[in-house]
């Protein structure tokens, strides 16, 4: 018997206080399948309908989350907030349910939603003004001639508060990219009641026109390319409609600010990308070697000439031919399209290199992840400790700490009878989470499992987001288990960047019951197994001070491979003393971020290394011990013969050779291991 939990609709930000009540209507989500009928907008038709409202909200330009915010920005210790107006997408013409912006659109920040169309399509925008003053919806692509021909009144370029207006136009060939250009071309839409004031107040969004048969019918976007629109501008709050109100909010009486004071003016100017300053724009997350298209926009006066640079990467522009570039000069009112194949995993910066702009915070970070870096984060191994796993409640002894994949015993999982339950994992630091493996459990003759669930996540434990991923609806509902023992691997594509992961059962059998593993990597995608277990590191690359041989067994260095099975399935030195070492030659400089160690067990004897040192060398002759906090780091190794233990290297080692020096052990020195890291990357 499958029990269903009812959920209520999701907001972009949820103030999460350990309860959830989300009501799911069928049209709110899809469960992997591409059932176009579920979508509030149907993208197969030639008319693409968008419901967009002007909505007022408070904005802090990311200052509350920036560690770099200048002291003088914050008065009396608080971060100033500014009333702004933004284009907000809704699910339908009732304008009651905002369309939740998932991971793929999170980067838009202050920008309105993407409006996408192909040549010959019709675009219909139903615009509602939910703000307190008149605004409009305007794009240079919209043709108003028909209105004139039909003898209609001249176009009113504003919509009063609480009024709705529908705009309809056909995408002409001249609006589209030429055959020599990239598949899609960027334009903008904004409000033109007073173009300058409207934009400085926040009303602008990207409008993409594409070649025919480019957009996926189910998703309404090009699924083979990941798109990011970046709007570089200096927001001047003195030019906002809400300037007076914002000044009163941020400078309480008696306020003795002088309007002409340069410091005052500078405090009301924000050198922003999509409305965020100083590396705070979220959502720029992309896969290594995946095609990325950047739409670069600038608006405003001539001071909004920007010199755009992506650290560590080149990009291409296409005008008849493709040109590789490292810098792009962006002029106001010009929307440029560039593409990139990010080849280097890690965290990089996109910035305007004009000194004043860069100094003032016109930069942000983009994260390139490697799809190869997907390892268990430690539920099964115990690397994720008991205290990191909490839940809304538990049934009897079925505690959250038991929610570990493959856990065995008569009570071997987390379980709860509560209808609105959740289980939370604190990874202690932000990680890239690529997927989740789930498993149910048995109690006597009953199969207990979660058949459907949703995922929420957070970087700080306060602001929570519901995972939407590639779903065409407002959130992704994952199919879980169908029995008590099988393992279901659900992939997060795009991956989740979070410290905290919440799993919320929506359907379950008898009780919500779970064993799980999280698959992921560190933020730099640099905790990949370098090849001990997989044998990508050859036998010849593994050497040692000595090794033990017996009549029918050789415990050679090449046996020091994590999870190796067989009779002599580890490295053992000839003698057990602290002078012995095991060495790996990577044959080129690698970035080493961790080591996983494991002991070994013969029939009755457990053998493992309890403590070890690490040294490194670039030439194989000069060796340096790994130091931390000014002293040689003694790594805590294994506590049994079978459980792998991960030790992180902080800071990471850039090295060709690595040595493990066992310092204390149980019974005998015996070692199986993996080295974690990635290729060392040249920065340019």
């Amino acid at each position: 018997e499958i029990t269903r939990t009812t959920l209520q609709s999701d907001q972009e930000e949820i103030d999460y206080d350990d309860t959830i009540s989300v009501e799911m209507k069928k049209e709110d989500f899809d469960i992997y399948d591409e059932d176009e009928n579920q979508s509030p907008r149907s993208f197969q038709k030639k008319t693409r309908h968008y419901f967009i409202a002007a909505v007022e909200r408070l904005w802090d330009y990311g200052m509350s989350s920036s560690p770099h915010v200048l002291r003088n920005r914050a008065q009396s210790g608080s971060v100033p907030q500014f009333k702004k107006v933004v284009f907000q997408e809704f699910t339908d013409g009732s304008f009651t349910q905002p369309l939740y912006r998932g991971e793929l659109n999170e980067h838009l920040g202050l920008l309105g939603p993407y409006i996408r169309a192909e040549v010959e399509d019709n675009i219909m925008v139903t615009f509602r003004n939910q703000a307190s003053r008149p605004y409009s919806f305007y794009s240079s692509l919209i043709s108003y001639e028909e209105d004139q021909r039909q003898g209609a009144e001249p176009r009113k370029n504003f919509v009063k508060p609480n009024e709705t207006k529908t705009y309809f136009w056909k995408v002409q060939h001249h609006m589209a990219p030429t055959k020599d250009e990239f598949d899609c071309k960027a334009w903008a839409y904004f409000s033109d009641v007073d173009l300058e004031k409207d934009v400085h107040s926040g009303l602008i969004g990207p409008l993409l026109v594409c070649h025919t048969n480019t957009l996926n019918p189910a998703h309404g976007r090009q699924v083979t390319v990941q798109e990011f629109a970046l709007f570089f501008t200096i927001f001047d709050e003195t030019k906002s409609w809400y300037f007076t109100e914002n000044m009163e909010r941020n400078c309480r009486a008696p306020c003795n600010i002088q309007m002409e004071d340069p410091t005052f003016k500078e405090n009301y100017r924000f050198h922003a990308i999509n409305g965020y300053i100083m590396d705070t724009l979220p959502g720029l997350v992309m896969a290594q070697d995946q095609r990325i298209r950047w739409y670069l926009l600038s608006m405003g006066s001539n001071e909004n000439i920007h010199s755009i640079h992506f650290s560590g990467h080149v990009f291409t522009v296409r005008k008849k031919e493709e040109y590789k570039m490292a810098l792009y000069n962006l002029y106001p009112g010009v929307f440029e399209t560039v593409e990139m194949l990010p080849s280097k995993a890690g965290i990089w910066r996109v910035e305007c290199l004009i000194g004043e702009h860069l100094h003032a915070g016109m930069s942000t970070l983009f994260l390139v992840y490697s799809n190869k870096c997907q390892t268990p984060l430690g539920m099964a191994s115990g690397h994720i400790r008991d205290f990191q796993i909490t839940a809304s409640g538990q049934y009897g002894q079925w505690a959250p700490k038991l929610a570990r994949l493959h856990y065995s015993g008569s009570i071997n999982a987390w379980s709860t009878k509560e209808p609105f339950s959740w289980i939370k994992v604190d990874l202690l630091a932000p990680m890239i989470i690529h997927g989740i493996k789930t498993q149910g459990a048995r109690q006597k003759f009953s199969s207990l499992y979660i058949s459907q669930f949703i995922i929420m996540y957070s970087l700080d434990g306060k602001k929570w987001q519901t995972y939407r991923g590639n779903s065409t609806g407002t959130l992704m509902v994952f199919f879980g288990n169908v029995d008590s023992s099988g393992i279901k691997h659900n992939i997060f594509n795009p991956p989740i960047i979070a410290r905290y992961i919440h799993l919320h059962p929506t359907h379950y059998s008898i009780r919500s019951t779970l064993r799980m593993e999280l698959m992921g990597c560190d933020l730099n995608s640099c905790s990949m197994p370098l090849g001990m277990e997989s044998k990508a590191i050859s036998d010849a690359q593994i050497t040692a001070s000595s090794y033990f041989t017996n009549m029918f067994a050789t415990w050679s260095p090449s046996k020091a491979r994590l999870h190796l099975q067989g009779r002599s399935n580890a490295w053992r030195p000839q003698v057990n003393n602290p002078k012995e070492w095991l060495q790996v030659d990577f044959q080129k400089t690698m970035k080493v971020t961790g080591v996983t160690t494991q002991g070994v067990k013969s029939l009755l004897t457990s053998m493992y290394v309890k403590e070890f040192l690490i040294s490194s060398s670039q030439d194989g002759h000069q060796w340096t011990l790994f130091f931390q906090n000014g002293k040689v780091k003694v790594f805590q190794g294994n506590q049994d013969s079978f459980t792998p233990v991960v030790n992180s290297l902080d800071p990471p080692l850039l090295t060709r050779y690595l040595r493990i020096h066992p310092q204390s052990w149980v019974h005998q020195i015996a070692l199986r291991m993996e080295v974690l890291g990635c290729e060392a990357q040249d920065l340019y």
């Epitope: 033990f548 041989t549 017996n550 009549m551 029918f552 067994a553 009779r567 000839q574 003698v575 057990n576 013969s602 029939l603 009755l604 004897t605 053998m607 005998q668």
Partner: antibody, heavy 117, light 108 residues
Framework: QVQLVQSGAEVKKPGASVKVSCKVS????????VHWVGQAPGKGLEWVGS????????IYAREFQGSVTMTADTSTDIAYMELSSLRSDDTAVYYC??????????WGQGTMVTVSS | EIALTQSPGTLSLSPGERATLSCRAS???????LAWYQQKPGQAPRLLIY???TRATGIPDRFSGSGSGTDFTLTISRLEPEDFAVYYC?????????FGQGTRLEIK
């Protein structure tokens, strides 16, 4: 738990052969080699030889070469030691033992072989 | 082939005393390959020490092993009544395995 159970005592005439068995339980025979050790009455321990059921390879002590054969039946997890051309000085208790992992950690209870005319 | 010689042949001590048993090899070898066994009448030998100094599982800490090269020692720090038995040293390894002739530890 891991156990080695040997076959019962044997009385043989000189020139005959004897086959002593050693049944392992608690693990699979191919996991470890089987060593055989003899102990004549009132005397010390003497290594006879070793057999690796995984590879079928055997190593015999010089004194026993030509008169001992070690085999195994991996389907039943039984190791065998056959002594041929028995002489009266072959009278001894024969032990099977397995290394865990190196020295002889696990021993059978011993099989008394008496060679007497 | 390496020969092992144990001394003394017989050691007579009282409970509570310290026993030191010696094992000398005809040529040097790695201490990794030296073991000590205890054998009581009518029983199979029992492993005490391997790798010259590592106690086997379940062996009381009054038993300790030391030595390298050609000279190895088994020490019983404080004799208990159940420790009176015959003790053998053994050289194991990659080829031939040899035992010493044994030291009988008897109650004085």
């Amino acid at each position: 738990q891991v156990q080695l159970v040997q076959s019962g005592a044997e009385v043989k005439k000189p020139g005959a052969s004897v086959k002593v068995s050693c049944k392992v339980s608690g693990y699979t025979l191919t996991e470890l080699p089987v060593h055989w050790v003899g102990q004549a009455p009132g005397k010390g321990l003497e290594w006879v030889g070793s057999f690796d059921p995984e590879s079928g390879e055997s190593i015999y002590a010089r004194e026993f070469q030509g008169s001992v054969t070690m085999t195994a039946d991996t389907s039943t997890d039984i190791a065998y030691m056959e002594l041929s051309s028995l002489r009266s000085d072959d009278t001894a208790v024969y032990y099977c033992a397995v290394p865990d992992p190196d020295a002889f950690d696990i021993w059978g209870q011993g099989t008394m072989v008496t060679v007497s005319s | 082939e390496i020969a092992l010689t144990q001394s003394p042949g017989t050691l007579s001590l009282s409970p509570g005393e310290r026993a030191t048993l010696s094992c000398r090899a005809s040529q040097s070898f790695s201490s990794s390959y030296l073991a000590w066994y205890q054998q009581k009448p009518g029983q199979a030998p029992r492993l005490l020490i391997y790798g010259a100094s590592t106690r086997a599982t379940g062996i009381p800490d009054r038993f300790s092993g030391s030595g390298s090269g050609t000279d190895f020692t088994l020490t019983i720090s404080r004799l208990e009544p159940e420790d009176f038995a015959v003790y053998y040293c053994q050289k194991y390894g990659t080829s031939a395995i040899t035992f010493g002739q044994g030291t009988r530890l008897e109650i004085k």
